[in-house]
Each structure stands twice: as structure tokens, then as C-alpha cells.
Interface confidence: medium
């Protein structure tokens, strides 16, 4: 299936040009998306190109500026947040990144009624997290690991927690491992629907071992960065959940929510919190051995001012073939009765589907079914359930939005997006207004991305929000590579792959092949999305064929494929890349003397193991910021898939699956190893150990470090990185510079 046919015709060839590396590094062909910032059923805010904050009313067709770019500029604001009562806006400036999601910032409160900044009782700086209540204009914020509450922006703050301490106790914000591997947010506090209560997590990292690395900066002495970071098998954070009445916060203070007994009996995690009503909350917990999850529905007891979580409202989700959930355990979407909910989990055939739970998980009603997977529940209204799946035409790398009419009998299912712009759009997400009155669809490809606004009742398109016209025009004279998504059937395993082919691809010729791999558990690389990136350039200008392959361990094709890697990372992911390469060679257009593999992070681990597989298939390869031993990576992620590194559990495979154990096998390949020295995620230690093992085995290799760079290798390092990797590959493939 050719997804993005090249627009090259002989008559046009003179005016068409190939992509250049400079195009990629400058972001010349980047695209825009439009996600409305919904503030009601029919209104949304959007930051205009000239930085005004504009309110749009879909029904009246009117728009007006609620905050001028002049006001934004007066405090150098880069972000904003309107209070639900529309009286105030917070303006965010001095953004300072911490980890993947977390950052600190300075916040100013602007009073829309009088057009002035709120003076008196200003917020401290820098703040770690700040948010409005869902109703009115109460503020909750985290400063120096403690939570504060303001009834109104100009009021003095009420301090909720007092034990916050850097790198020791975190209130309302996650520690490193919870941020990266469990919550995937910068916050750990949640307002109840009407703002009566505020729930928050407290993480105690007192006993967690600390990772320390040098940050060189430009001082005479480097700084040492210390992060409590539990590696596999190490002591984990201790988590507690509290809820405080924000109307009378001093009355009884924060009340702890009890942990289910079956969870509390050994090490455990808190995985998410979902408010149902102001007086009902749902907490999800997970055993440290992550195959048992418990969903606990708790009710406020007015007489005792406590939270009660009856055993009858505990729902257990257990996996017997792998870990609980996909990447994370799914979260519930509650129905209007405030007790039943919809949730995605594996059905009896091992496919993730939507289930409706009223009393017990055993009595769950399966809502979707088939040899495909439901991926996200966007919204449940009284009449409809909106979700995404990869059902359409049996392509796992697509995403379409569906609506099930749950208010009628028999319920009907409709694909909202399947036939809208079929060639251009096969990978969607959606954003819904209150009560799903309207929604935005954001299409990511395979054609040029487009964002549109729709009526939630009829699904009619109302208007185009962003269609990337400039990008479309800019690409008119570019020789883009061809892309195809197909599958290989090998030993009862389906291997989907994406192949990126040079513009004038000719099956009778031989091309160098580059495998790009990620391959981590529950990931997906073969997706029907638009991208003009480094590998597009390598195909367009340098004439390489690039392939991405989703092997065992990858997502959205059922549990058999997903859980195949359980407790044995580094085996089947590598095997499947190798199998695919052999199949590509059989296709006849690959030069088998010029095959390379590269990957980043988990992909760096897989590419390293593939290079060291001893197959002789690969001439060279690159590993960027690779994991080299699972003993070096975070507990929450690693143990989910590998169990514990103990003798009575899975220590043997932890030891067998290291890159270092295969040092000798790098002798006959050209290996480029790259890592940032300030990588908080996959520590530089990983590459340091690979390098040490290679030196000890007297194996030659190439390496590049990026001083003070983290796992993303951003800024000028990005340019240097891709330039360096390009030179390496061109040398490997004997391509002239």
C-alpha cells in the first residue's frame, strides 16, 4: 500500500529537489495541529499567531480577545489559564524545565474585571505546579514540595502540607519515577468536580538510593545532580493519598484514603485517581509485581469526615500471561449513575476492549470485540460513547474515532472518521467540549495533518481549524520518499513494517538498508502518520531504504504479541528485527553488504543487541542513549516487564540480557555509541559500561558524548547528533559526501 506517493513526473524533475539535512534540522517541513482549549460546551480559547488569547463561541460565530498580547508580553508569559468563573487568568513565565513533564515557573494573576494584575499576597516563585479549581477561582499550587490553597487569588494562602522537603517528601507533585513511569504528569493533585475537595499524593523518597552525576556547566567545579531514583530491585517511594475539604481546610485537615488490604500487604504503587462526584472518588493501586491492579471506589462519610472504601467496591484486574494493562493500567470512565464505569482491558481472546462494569469485573459486559484493540475512551455522555481503535481495514497502525449510541436500543456503532478524508487521514485523535456538544478531530496522517471542528450530535464538519496550507505549498517542489505499510507472516507471527523508499525507487536496483528500531514493550513504530524527518532525508537525498518493524512486545495487536516478551526483554524484539531484515533481502532490492540499524533509548538497546547477534547481517549501527543492563533502569518500568533481579525471581535473565555480555560480538561491526552525560532517565552509566566492556574486550568502536545533555539531546546537540550520524552512515554505506 503506497501511503504517500511521490509526486515526481519526468516533466517536473527539473523543478523538484530532494530533502536536505538542513531542511530537517531547521524544521522547514514541520506541521501544526489545533487543539481547542474548551471552556464550555460551545466555547474555546486559542492563542492566536500574534499571541492574543481569543475566545471563540461556535454557536454565535463570534470571537473576542480576552487577553491582549500586550498583557502577555508585559510579564513575558508563554502560557495562560482562565479561571472557570472567567474572572481571572494566570500567566506563566520563566519556564524552567525539570524532567519530562515537570517544570517550574513564575505565575502572575490577571484580574479580567478591572484589567489589572492582582496585587497583594502575590504567589511565591518558582512554583512547581498551579491550577484553578474546576468551579469558581480557587487556586491550588505547589511550592517547595508543599501544597497551598487560595480561596481567591488575592487572599493569603492556606498551607495544606508542611513536611515537603527537596528530594525527600513530595506533596502534590510526583518524584522522578512516578512522573516518568506511572503518572506521566507533572502533578499529583486532583480537584473534585465542583471544587469541594482536593485530593493529593505524598511521595516519601527518604530511603530511595540516589543517582548522582556531574553537570559541568561553566564554573570551575562541576555541580553534582542528585535524584532519588529507584533502579530495578531497589527501595521504592512510599505513597499515601490524602483528601482535604477546601471549603473548611482547617476544620479536620487532610484525611488519608485507606489502601486496599490485598494491596497493602506488600510493596505497591498508586497508579491514578479519578473523581466520580464531589463525595465519591476512585483510586487505582498496583502491586509492585505489576500483574495485579485494584480499583477502589471510596465514599465520603459526612458524620466522621472520613473516606470509606468498602471491599464491595474493590475491583481486581489481574493478568495471568503478562503485566496488568498495556503500558499503563487503563483508567475508568464513569457513567452518569456515578457507580458503573467503562474501562479497557483484555477480553478472553487476549485483545484489549471496552467493558462496562456495574457490580463486579467478573460480570463485566463487553462492549467492543474483535481481533483488533480499543485504544482510548474519549468521552461518555448519556447517549454516546466515543472511543478510538485500530479496527478499520485491519491496519494496527491506524486510529479512527467511533461512536456507540448507548442511549438507544439496540446500540449502534458508527465510525466517525473512517471515510472523512480516507487517503489523507487514517490516524486521528479527538478533543471534546463539555457534554460532547462539539469536538475537534486532529488527523496526523499519512497525508498532511489537518484539524477540524465537528458537531457532537450530527458529526457534521463545521470548519477547518488548521490545514497546514503553507506546508503543503512548501512540499510541492520536494521529492518526498514513497512510504508503504505492509506485513510479513513468519511462524504464526505477523510483523507489520513501514518501508520508506527513495523517490525514484526501482525494484530492479540494489539499495542500502537502514533499520530504525524502538521495539519497547507496548510501543508502536509502524503508524500511518505524516513525518518529514531525518529518515525521510536519508531516503530522499541519500537513496537509502529505511524500514521500521513492529515485532513481538509491541502494542495494539493482542496480548499474544504484547506479552511474548514478558520476563525476557532483549530476546524476541531482536530476533524479529533480524527476521524482517532477512525477508527484506529476499525482496531483491536490498544490497546485503550495506545494512545498518539504529535506535534511541530502548531502540539503542535493541540495535546494540542486533549488532552483537553474530548474524553477520549488519555492517554498522548506532545506539543513542541505550539501556545496557536492566539493573540500571527504573524499577517501575523494568520490573513491570522483567520481574525482580533476585535469585528466586529473574536475576538470571537480567544478567543474560545485557549489552556488555555480548562485547566480543561487536568485533565485526562498526558501532557508534552516543549518550548525553546529564541523562536523568537512561543514565550515562549505561553507555559507560558498554564502552568499558568493549575496551576490555579490545574491540574498536566509535563514540560521542554530549556534555550536560539529557535523554532528548536537544538544541544545538540535535544538529550535531544528526550531522554526525549522517556522516557515519554515509561512510558505512560508501556514499560520497
Amino acid at each position: 500500500i503506497v501511503l504517500r506517493p511521490s509526486r515526481v513526473h519526468n516533466s517536473e524533475e527539473n523543478t523538484m529537489r530532494a530533502l536536505t539535512l538542513k531542511d530537517i534540522l531547521n524544521g522547514t517541513f514541520s506541521y501544526k495541529t489545533f487543539f481547542p482549549n474548551w471552556i464550555s460546551g460551545q466555547e474555546y480559547l486559542h492563542q492566536s499567531a500574534d499571541n492574543n488569547i481569543v475566545l471563540y463561541n461556535i454557536e454565535t460565530g463570534q470571537s473576542y480577545t480576552i487577553l491582549s498580547n500586550r498583557t502577555m508580553k508585559s510579564v513575558n508569559a508563554s502560557n495562560y489559564g482562565l479561571s472557570p468563573d472567567r474572572q481571572f487568568v494566570y500567566l506563566e513565565s520563566d519556564y524552567s524545565k525539570l524532567w519530562r513533564y515537570s517544570y517550574t515557573a513564575t505565575y502572575y494573576i490577571y484580574d479580567l474585571s478591572n484589567g489589572e494584575f492582582v496585587r497583594g499576597n502575590e504567589l511565591p516563585r518558582p512554583i512547581q505546579y498551579l491550577c484553578w479549581s474546576p468551579v469558581g477561582s480557587k487556586l491550588a499550587y505547589v511550592y517547595q514540595n508543599n501544597i497551598y490553597l487560595k480561596q481567591r487569588p488575592g487572599d493569603p494562602p492556606f498551607q495544606i502540607t508542611f513536611n515537603g522537603r527537596e528530594n525527600k517528601i513530595f506533596n502534590g507533585i510526583p518524584d522522578w519515577v512516578y512522573e516518568e513511569e506511572m503518572l506521566a504528569t507533572k502533578y499529583a493533585l486532583w480537584w473534585s468536580p465542583n471544587g469541594k475537595f482536593l485530593a493529593y499524593a505524598e511521595f516519601n523518597d527518604t530511603d530511595i538510593p540516589v543517582i548522582a552525576y556531574s553537570y559541568y556547566g561553566d564554573e570551575q567545579y562541576p555541580r553534582t545532580i542528585n535524584i532519588p531514583y529507584p533502579k530495578a530491585g531497589a527501595k521504592n517511594p512510599v505513597v499515601r493519598i490524602f483528601i482535604i475539604d477546601t471549603t473548611y481546610p482547617a476544620y479536620v485537615g487532610p484525611q488519608e484514603v485507606p489502601v486496599p488490604a490485598m494491596i497493602a500487604s506488600s510493596d505497591y504503587y498508586f497508579s491514578w485517581l479519578t473523581w466520580v462526584t464531589d463525595e465519591r472518588v476512585c483510586l487505582q493501586w498496583l502491586k509492585r509485581v505489576q500483574n495485579v491492579s485494584v480499583l477502589s471506589i471510596c465514599d465520603f462519610r459526612e458524620d466522621w469526615q472520613t473516606w470509606d472504601c468498602p471491599k464491595t467496591q474493590e475491583h481486581i484486574e489481574e493478568s495471568r500471561t503478562g503485566w496488568a494493562g498495556g503500558f499503563f493500567v487503563s483508567t475508568p470512565v464513569f457513567s452518569y449513575d456515578a457507580i458503573s464505569y467503562y474501562k479497557i482491558f483484555s477480553d478472553k481472546d487476549g485483545y484489549k476492549h471496552i467493558h462496562y462494569i456495574k457490580d463486579t469485573v467478573e460480570n463485566a459486559i463487553q462492549i467492543t470485540s474483535g481481533k483488533w484493540e480499543a485504544i482510548n475512551i474519549f468521552r461518555v455522555t448519556q447517549d454516546s460513547l466515543f472511543y478510538s481503535s485500530n479496527e478499520f481495514e485491519e491496519y494496527p497502525g491506524r486510529r479512527n474515532i467511533y461512536r456507540i449510541s448507548i442511549g438507544s436500543y439496540p446500540p449502534s456503532k458508527k465510525c466517525v472518521t473512517c471515510h472523512l478524508r480516507k487517503e489523507r487521514c487514517q490516524y486521528y485523535t479527538a478533543s471534546f467540549s463539555d457534554y460532547a456538544k462539539y469536538y475537534a478531530l486532529v488527523c496526523y496522517g499519512p497525508g498532511i495533518p489537518i484539524s477540524t471542528l465537528h458537531d457532537g450530535r450530527t458529526d457534521q464538519e463545521i470548519k477547518i481549524l488548521e490545514e497546514n496550507k503553507e506546508l503543503e505549498n512548501a512540499l510541492k517542489n520536494i521529492q518526498l520518499p514513497k512510504e508503504e505499510i505492509k506485513k510479513l507472516e513468519v511462524d504464526e507471527i505477523t510483523l507489520w513494517y513501514k518501508m520508506i523508499l527513495p523517490p525514484q525507487f526501482d525494484r530492479s536496483k540494489k539499495y542500502p538498508l537502514l533499520i530504525q528500531v524502538y521495539g519497547g514493550p507496548c510501543s508502536q513504530s509502524v503508524r500511518s502518520v505524516f513525518a518529514v524527518n531525518w529518515i525521510s532525508y536519508l531516503a530522499s537525498k541519500e537513496g537509502m531504504v529505511i524500514a521500521l518493524v513492529d515485532g513481538r512486545g509491541t502494542a495494539f495487536q493482542g496480548d499474544k504479541l504484547l506479552y511474548a516478551v514478558y520476563r525476557k526483554l532483549g530476546v524476541y524484539e531482536v530476533e524479529d528485527q533480524i527476521t524482517a531484515v532477512r525477508k527484506f533481502i529476499e525482496m531483491g532490492f536490498i544490497d546485503e553488504k550495506r545494512i545498518a540499524i539504529w535506535g534511541w533509548s530502548y531502540g539503542g538497546y535493541v540495535s546494540s543487541l542486533a549488532l552483537a547477534s553474530g548474524t553477520g547481517l549488519f555492517k554498522c549501527g548506532i545506539a543513542v542513549a541505550p539501556v545496557s543492563s536492566w539493573e540500571y533502569y527504573a524499577s517501575v518500568y523494568t520490573e513491570r516487564f522483567m520481574g525482580l533481579p533476585t535469585k528466586d525471581d529473574n536475576l538470571e535473565h537480567y544478567k543474560n540480557s545485557t549489552v556488555m555480555a555480548r562485547a566480543e560480538y561487536f568485533r565485526n561491526v562498526d558501532y557508534l555509541l552516543i549518550h548525553g552525560t546529564a541523562d536523568d532517565n537512561v543514565h550515562f552509566q549505561n553507555s559507560a559500561q558498554i564502552a568499558k566492556a568493549l575496551v576490555n574486550a579490545q574491540v574498536d568502536f566509535q563514540a560521542m558524548w554530549y556534555s550536560d545533555q539529557n535523554h532528548g539531546l536537544s538544541g544545538l546537540s540535535t544538529n550535531h547528533l544528526y550531522t554526525h550520524m549522517t556522516h557515519f552512515l554515509k561512510q558505512c554505506f560508501s556514499l560520497s559526501d
Epitope: D337, I339, Y356, K358, I365, Q382, D383, I406, G407, Y409
Partner: nanobody, 118 residues
Framework: EVQLVESGGGLVQPGGSLRLSCAAS????????MGWFRQAPGKGRELVAA????????YYPDSVEGRFTISRDNAKRMVYLQMNSLRAEDTAVYYC???????????WGQGTQVTVSS
Amino acid sequence: EVQLVESGGGLVQPGGSLRLSCAASGRTFSYNPMGWFRQAPGKGRELVAAISRTGGSTYYPDSVEGRFTISRDNAKRMVYLQMNSLRAEDTAVYYCAAADFPMHFNYWGQGTQVTVSS
């Protein structure tokens, strides 16, 4: 939980009409799709009418389409089945039912007998 009590059954001549009522208790009533089923002697239970939570959409099998009408009053927590042009084959015990999810009726009343005979 939803408790359901039917009334309005009885003996009626062919071609006649009858209105069945179902009183519901339980706080989740307005969130439940509702239905009427019937069971004739020696036969299985058959759905004869269903209505959505809001009352905005209804369903009837071909056998009763145009003769039976289902309606609901969420404020009074009542569901009704208006049966016109009754036939002998409509004779059965009629049950009111509430669903968790549209295709899944799992709360049932005790039933009310309807007999169509001359």
C-alpha cells in the same frame, strides 16, 4: 439497584387496547434504558419494546411495530406500554425490565398477565 412493579394487565378482546404501567424505584432509574418483554406459555422471553434513557429513541420488533408504543416519565419514575389492536398471539406474561447497558437487561419486575380472548 432498581426495583420494578408492573400493573395494568388483564383480559381484553381481540382488537382491544390495554396500557401497562411500570413503577421503578432506585436512584439510578433515569440512567437506565427500559424495556418490556413478554413470555407466552412454553416459549422464551421476547423483547417487545425498548426505550432509551432520555426517551429520545425507541425500538420495536416487527411483530408489534405500529401497534405498541413505549414511553417513560423520568420525573414520575414510570414506564408505560400502550398496546392497541391486540391479537390472541399477544397473550403472555408481560415483564418490565431495566438495562445497565442497552443490550443488557438485568433488572426485572414480577410480571403482569395479559390475556387476549373473545
